[in-house]
C-alpha cells in the first residue's frame, strides 16, 4: 500500500537536488580561492540536516544554523548590491564589476540559487512532488527561511554606500512585501551604513520619467530616513548601456546620462 | 578595530563557581553570534556554550545544566555564569564573535583552573 503523502502547493524539491549543491559547492571552492578549505560533504551534511525528518512547515533559523556557520565567507562591507526583482541584471552587473557582490555571489547564496527543497516529518526522505508555497500553505518552509536567514545577515554585513538595483517596470518599483522590503531594509545597520543607493531601472526604450519621484520610492526613502540612513536615488534609463558603460567606462558615449 | 577581552577566569575548587565576560568593541554585537571556546593543554579548541544573535543557546553535552551563556546588547558583553565546576573544565577559555558574511574574531582567552 502506497504511503500517504502529503501534497503542497508548491513545486517540489528540484531534481538532484543532493548532486546539485554539492556539484556547485565544489565549483564555487575551486573558483575562489578564499573558500578552498571548505568542506563540501560538511556542507551539504549541514543543508540536509536543517531540513530532512522536519515538518516542511516548521524550519526555523536555528535549522540553518550549522550551514551559516560553515558558509562564513567575509564580505566586503562596502561592495553589496541588494537587488528587488531584477535578479537577473543585478547578476550580470556583478560578472562585470568583480569586486561588487550580490548574495547569490557568496557561497551559500550560490548553493541555493533558483532552487527548491523540503522534506517530510520524520523520515529521511526529500520531497521531490511537492512543497509548500509561501502563500498558499506557509512562510516557514526550508527555502523561504533559508533566503530570510542568508538575507538578513548579508544586510547585517553591509557598510559604508549600499546599491540596491530595483526594477523600474513593476508596479511596485519598491514593494515591502519583497524579501528587501521586508527583511533587507530592516537589517542594514544605521551604526555602519552611510547611504542606501537606489538605482531604477527603466523598461521601455523611450522611458524618461523620473522613476525616482515614484511613491513607492519615496515610502522607500521615508523608511530608510526613519532608520537614521540617507537615501538617495538613480534612474538607470539604458539597462543595456549602463553594462556596457560598467564593462568599458572610458568609452566616448559613457559620459552622458545612462 | 576589533577586539574581544575576556576576563573572570581564575582558580577554583571543585563543586566552585565562576562567571566569565567577553567585553567586545569595534562591532556591532547584537548581529553577532557569539560562543565560549576552551582549550586544555594537548587538546584541540572546543565549543563549550554559543549564543545566536537571535537568542538561541546551544550547549556542549559534557557542560548542559551546569554553565548557562548569556548576552547583553546593550553592553556588548557575553557572560558564561559556570557551576559545579570540575577539574575537567580546566583550560584556557576563549570569547568568539560569528557572521556568516562579517567575519569571526577571537579573544586572547582566559585561563580556568580548578584544583583543591
Known amino acids: 500500500v502506497p504511503r500517504w503523502r502529503q501534497q503542497w502547493s508548491g513545486p517540489g524539491t528540484t531534481k538532484r537536488f543532493p548532486e546539485t549543491v554539492l556539484a556547485r559547492c565544489v565549483k564555487y571552492t575551486e573558483i575562489h580561492p578564499e573558500m578552498r578549505h571548505v568542506d563540501c560533504q560538511s556542507v551539504w551534511d549541514a543543508f540536509k540536516g536543517a531540513f530532512i525528518s522536519k515538518h516542511p512547515c516548521n524550519i526555523t533559523e536555528e535549522d540553518y544554523q550549522p550551514l551559516m556557520k560553515l558558509g562564513t565567507q567575509t564580505v566586503p562591507c562596502n561592495k553589496i548590491l541588494l537587488w528587488s526583482r531584477i535578479k537577473d541584471l543585478a547578476h550580470q552587473f556583478t560578472q562585470v564589476q568583480r569586486d561588487m557582490f550580490t548574495l547569490e555571489d557568496t557561497l551559500l547564496g550560490y548553493l541555493a540559487d533558483d532552487l527548491t527543497w523540503c522534506g517530510e516529518f520524520n523520515t529521511s526522505k526529500i520531497n521531490y512532488q511537492s512543497c509548500p508555497d509561501w502563500r498558499k500553505d506557509c512562510s516557514n518552509n526550508p527555502v523561504s527561511v533559508f533566503w530570510k536567514t542568508v538575507s538578513r545577515r548579508f544586510a547585517e554585513a553591509a557598510c559604508d554606500v549600499v546599491h540596491v538595483m530595483l526594477n523600474g517596470s513593476r508596479s511596485k518599483i519598491f514593494d515591502k512585501n519583497s524579501t528587501f522590503g521586508s527583511v533587507e531594509v530592516h537589517n542594514l545597520q544605521p551604526e555602519k551604513v552611510q547611504t542606501l543607493e537606489a538605482w531604477v531601472i527603466h523598461g521601455g526604450r523611450e522611458d524618461s520619467r523620473d522613476l525616482c519621484q515614484d511613491p513607492t520610492i519615496k515610502e522607500l526613502e521615508s523608511i530608510i530616513s526613519k532608520r537614521n540612513i540617507q537615501f538617495s536615488c538613480k534612474n538607470i534609463y539604458r539597462p543595456d548601456k549602463f553594462l556596457q558603460c560598467v564593462k568599458n567606462p572610458e568609452d566616448s558615449s559613457c559620459t552622458s546620462e545612462i | 578595530q576589533v577586539q574581544l577581552q575576556e576576563s573572570g577566569g581564575g582558580l577554583v575548587q571543585p563543586g566552585g563557581s565562576l562567571r566569565l565576560s567577553c567585553a567586545a568593541s569595534g562591532i556591532i554585537l547584537r548581529i553577532y553570534d557569539m560562543g565560549w571556546y576552551r582549550q586544555a593543554p594537548g587538546k584541540q579548541r572546543e565549543l563549550v556554550a554559543e549564543?545566536?544573535?537571535?537568542?538561541?543557546?546551544n550547549y556542549a553535552d559534557s557542560v548542559k545544566g551546569r554553565f548557562t551563556i548569556s548576552r547583553d546588547n546593550a553592553e556588548n558583553t557575553v557572560s558564561l555564569q559556570m557551576n559545579s565546576l570540575k577539574p575537567g573544565d580546566t583550560a584556557v577559555y576563549y570569547c568568539?564573535?560569528?557572521?556568516?558574511?562579517?567575519?569571526?574574531?577571537w579573544g586572547q582567552g582566559t585561563q580556568v583552573t580548578v584544583s583543591s
Open positions: 549564543i545566536t544573535s537571535g537568542g538561541s543557546t
Open positions: 568568539n564573535a560569528h557572521h556568516t558574511f562579517a567575519g569571526a574574531y
